[in-house]
């Protein structure tokens, strides 16, 4: 039921990377606006992107609040102009989205290699950590924040005049590895979250290799 | 439930080629790397090497590498493992293993491949 | 390539307490699994040295860095071919295996 020419959300979606988190809908409106509500399991509603014509909505701030905590939002459809107006029932036409638990299910993004540097026969690479909306003591966290021991960087690294690959995890940001004298290596590197059962895995990085400006060389 | 169902038994001759399949059931195929490991008569386990679904790397462990080729069928999670030029040496019990990363937790029920001439 | 050495290579026992231990070739954390095999497939014990892969808390893990050790108070069916791993890089070596025989 509902306001005549007025139709109700469909294709609840979220959209999350590294709590970067949009809820997406669909239809595109016709004459008609969409009100965004968001709250926790026990918590109360809070709205947000206001009779707006988007079909979709940047929920990043609250879910930040609380990344272990589960949520769920919903859409409201106005007819345009008159939003004041509403269903058969006295209630806006309204869909729930499925629930979302941003540290269970937001995306991990590309990690970046931020150095490397060789020293001999090995070599140290670092993962950049990179910054969340995840706030603190008004200071925001990084992912290693976030996630701590939860989260592991897989390291694939390769000599450059050969295909075949090695590997390596580490639970902090930085890798040491071993390295033949005289060999250039190239590095790629991909996030992982073992304790989840989907949404595991980032892509993996740019790769980047020795010889390029990156690196730091250095003969002991 | 999570399960990992491998193709059957195989007896080739020195030279010839086999491939072992590892049907993948009860969880999110991508989202887990493969990994194959052998067992040879009256030896201990022998890691060979992994593939991620997710994104096509594999990793050889030294010994292998030639000698085994892995691949994935997302469309059908399954997994596959072909053992080329084989050899008496080869026959052995072959596993396929789900890795979390910090361990292998579900495993197949093994294929044994025996080369004889 | 990091060894994995483990020992003993069997071990005869009654029901009770036995230690298998494993010695890494260089530090690995705890980038260490356990694993038994009772003759048909591996089964996980222990990942990540320490924690416990829904199995009875007879077993338990210990260690980090290069030493690691295995303790199980013996049960009948716990007779089986235990394995460490090492989970930290590739090639991701197994040790060598100890063989607990009923005594």
């Known amino acids: 039921s509902g306001t005549t020419n007025t139709v109700a959300a469909y294709n609840l979606t979220w959209k999350s990377t590294n709590f970067k988190t949009i809820l997406e809908w669909e239809p595109k409106p016709v004459n008609q606006v969409y009100t965004v509500q968001i709250s926790t399991k026990s918590g109360d509603w809070k709205s947000k992107c206001f009779y707006t014509t988007d079909t979709e909505c940047d929920l990043t701030d609250e879910i930040v609040k609380d990344v272990k905590q589960t949520y769920l939002a919903r859409v409201f459809s106005y007819p345009a102009g008159n939003v004041e107006s509403t269903g058969s029932a006295g209630e806006p036409l309204y869909e729930n989205s499925p629930e979302f638990t941003p540290y269970l299910e937001t995306n991990l993004g590309q990690p970046t290699i931020q150095s490397f540097e060789q020293v001999g026969t090995k070599v140290n690479v670092t993962v950049e950590d990179e910054r969340t909306l995840v706030r603190r003591n008004n200071t925001f966290l990084s992912l290693r924040d976030v996630f701590g021991k939860d989260l592991i960087y897989t390291l694939y690294y390769w000599k450059s005049s050969s295909s075949g690959k090695k590997t390596a995890k580490t639970n902090t940001n930085e890798f040491l590895i071993d390295v033949d004298k005289g060999e250039n290596y190239c590095f790629s590197v991909q996030a992982v979250i073992p304790s989840r059962t989907v949404n595991r895995k980032s892509t993996d990085s740019p790769v980047e290799c020795m010889g390029q400006e990156k690196g730091e060389f250095r003969e002991i | 439930q999570i399960q990992l169902v491998q193709s059957g038994g195989e007896v080739k001759k020195p030279g010839a080629s086999v491939r072992v399949s590892c049907k993948a059931s009860g969880y999110s195929f991508t989202d887990y790397n493969v990994y194959w490991v052998r067992q040879s008569p009256g030896k201990g386990l022998e890691w060979i090497g992994y593939?991620?679904?997710?994104?096509?790397?594999?990793i050889y462990d030294q010994n292998f590498k030639g000698k085994a080729t892995l691949t994935v069928d997302k469309s059908t999670s399954t997994a596959y493992m072909e053992l080329s030029s084989l050899r008496s040496e080869d026959t052995a019990v072959y596993f396929c293993?789900?890795?979390?990363?910090?361990?292998?937790?579900?495993w197949g029920q093994g294929t044994t491949v025996t080369v004889s001439s | 390539d990091i060894q994995m050495t483990q020992s003993p290579a069997s071990l005869s026992a009654s029901v009770g307490r036995v230690t298998i231990t494993c010695l890494a070739s260089q530090t690995i954390d705890t980038w260490l699994a356990w694993l038994q095999k009772p003759g048909k497939s591996p089964q996980l014990l222990i990942y990540a040295?320490?924690?416990?892969?829904g199995v009875p808390s007879r077993f338990s893990g210990s260690g980090s860095g290069t030493d690691f050790s295995f303790i199980s108070s013996l049960q009948p069916e716990d007779f089986a071919t235990y394995y460490c791993?090492?989970?930290?890089?590739?090639?991701?070596?197994f040790g060598q295996g100890t063989k607990l025989e009923i005594k």
């Open positions: 293993a789900r890795d979390v990363t910090t361990a292998l937790d579900f």
């Open positions: 593939i991620d679904p997710y994104n096509g790397i594999t």
């Open positions: 040295a320490t924690n416990l892969d």
């Open positions: 791993q090492q989970v930290y890089s590739s090639p991701f070596t």
